[in-house]
C-alpha cells in the first residue's frame, strides 16, 4: 500500500483507573478546524452512540460524565471521561462530522480496577495521539480511519 497521511489520529489504546478519569487527545489536520468533533461508543461504526459533540466552537461541552473541547489553533480536541466504571471499557471513536464522509479513529478504552478505596483526588490519565502521521506497510499500526458513516478505512498498514 502506498503511504497515506491520515486526517485524524488518536491513541490506539487508553487505560483508566476505576473511579478515576482519563483524557484522550485526538489530532486532526488543517482544514477541519470549524467542523464538529465527537466521541462515540461502539465497535460497529454505524451503530456507535455519540456521547458528546462540540458545538463548532472551542467551548467545552459536557454530557453526563464525558466532556469534549476543541482547540482549533492546535488542531487537537480533548475528550475527558470521569468517574470511570468497569463498564466504560469498550471501543470508542474520535470523530469529525462531515457531510457524506465522516472522519474517525478507533480508541480502545480499558479500565483497571481500583485496588484501594476511592482516593480523595481521583486519578487522571492523559493519552495523546501518536506523533506518527504517516503509516507504512512495514508497521501494522492503526492510526487513523476515514469513515463513510460506517466503517470506512482510509489507511491501515
Amino acid at each position: 500500500d502506498a503511504s497515506i497521511v491520515t486526517q485524524i489520529t488518536g491513541p490506539t489504546t487508553v487505560n483508566g483507573l476505576e473511579r478515576g478519569s482519563l483524557t484522550v487527545q485526538c489530532v486532526y489536520r488543517s482544514g477541519w478546524e470549524t467542523y464538529l468533533k465527537w466521541w462515540c461508543r461502539g465497535a460497529i461504526w454505524r451503530d456507535c452512540k455519540i456521547l458528546v459533540k462540540t458545538s463548532g466552537s472551542e467551548q467545552e461541552v459536557k454530557r453526563d460524565r464525558v466532556s469534549i473541547k476543541d482547540n482549533q489553533k492546535n488542531r487537537t480536541f480533548t475528550v475527558t471521561m470521569e468517574d470511570l466504571m468497569k463498564t466504560d471499557a469498550d471501543t470508542y471513536w474520535c470523530g469529525i462530522e462531515k457531510t457524506g464522509n465522516d472522519l474517525g479513529v478507533t480508541v480502545q478504552v480499558t479500565i483497571d480496577p481500583a485496588s484501594t478505596p476511592a482516593p480523595t483526588t481521583p486519578t487522571s490519565t492523559t493519552f495523546t495521539a501518536p506523533v506518527t502521521q504517516e503509516e507504512t506497510s512495514s508497521s501494522p499500526t492503526l492510526t487513523g480511519h476515514h469513515l463513510d458513516n460506517r466503517h470506512k478505512l482510509l489507511k491501515l498498514s
Epitope: A43, I44, D90, T91, Q108, L142, D148, N149, R150
Partner: antibody
Amino acid sequence: QIQLVQSGPELEKPGETVKISCKASGYTFTNYPMHWVKQAPGKGLKWMGWINTYSGVPTYADDFKGRFAFSLETSASTAYLQINNLKNEDMATYFCARMDYYSNGFNYWGQGTTLTVSS
Amino acid sequence: DVLMTQTPLSLPVSLGDQASISCRSSQSIVHSNGNTYLEWYLQKPGQSPKLLIYKVSNRFSGVPDRFSGSGSGTDFTLKISRVEAEDLGVYYCFQGSHVPWTFGGGTKLEIK
C-alpha cells in the same frame, strides 16, 4: 494479503459440543470485529452476530443466544464459534466474515466450515 | 426483525440478457444516521458469498459496471445489464441497518 481461514469439516452427534476456528492474517486482528453467518444445507444465509476482537465482548442475534458462544485467541489472531448441546438443526456451513471500513459490507469471508450432526 | 423478501426465487436468463432482482424489506431500512445499509452478495456453488454492492448503489471495488443497485426505503433492485457465465449463482440482498441484520432468501440466476 488478507485471509480468513476456517477449520475443517466436523461430524458430531446430537448433544455434543463443537468449536469452529477462524484464523485471520494480513491485517491487525483486533482492529476489526468478526461476524459469523450460518447457512443450512440448500438454504439462505443467516447473520448470527459478532464479537469485538479487542474486548472479546460478543453480540448474538436472538436465534443464537444460549447454546452459541463466540470467543477469541487474540495472540493467534483467531476467532472461535462454539456450539453446545448440538441439535440436528445446527447442521450447516458456518462462515466467519469481516466487514471492511471502506466497503460498508462483508468483503472478507472464510471458506466456511461444514458441520454435520448425525447420530 | 426486518424480513427481506427477494423475487423471483429463480431467474432463468440467456447470456447477454439483462437480469433484474427485487428485494423488499418489511420496514424502512434507513438507519438512524440517515444511511441505508442495503448490500448485495453473490454466492457461487461451493464458495463463500462475495460482496457486489453496498449502501444500495455503491459497487464494491473490482465489481464490473454491468452490476448496478438502486432503490430506497423498502424497495431495492439489483440489475445486471448483460449477464455473463461468471454471474451465475445465488444473489442475496442484506440489510445492516437494524439489528438483527438479515439476508433475503436468495435468487438463483441460471441459464435458460
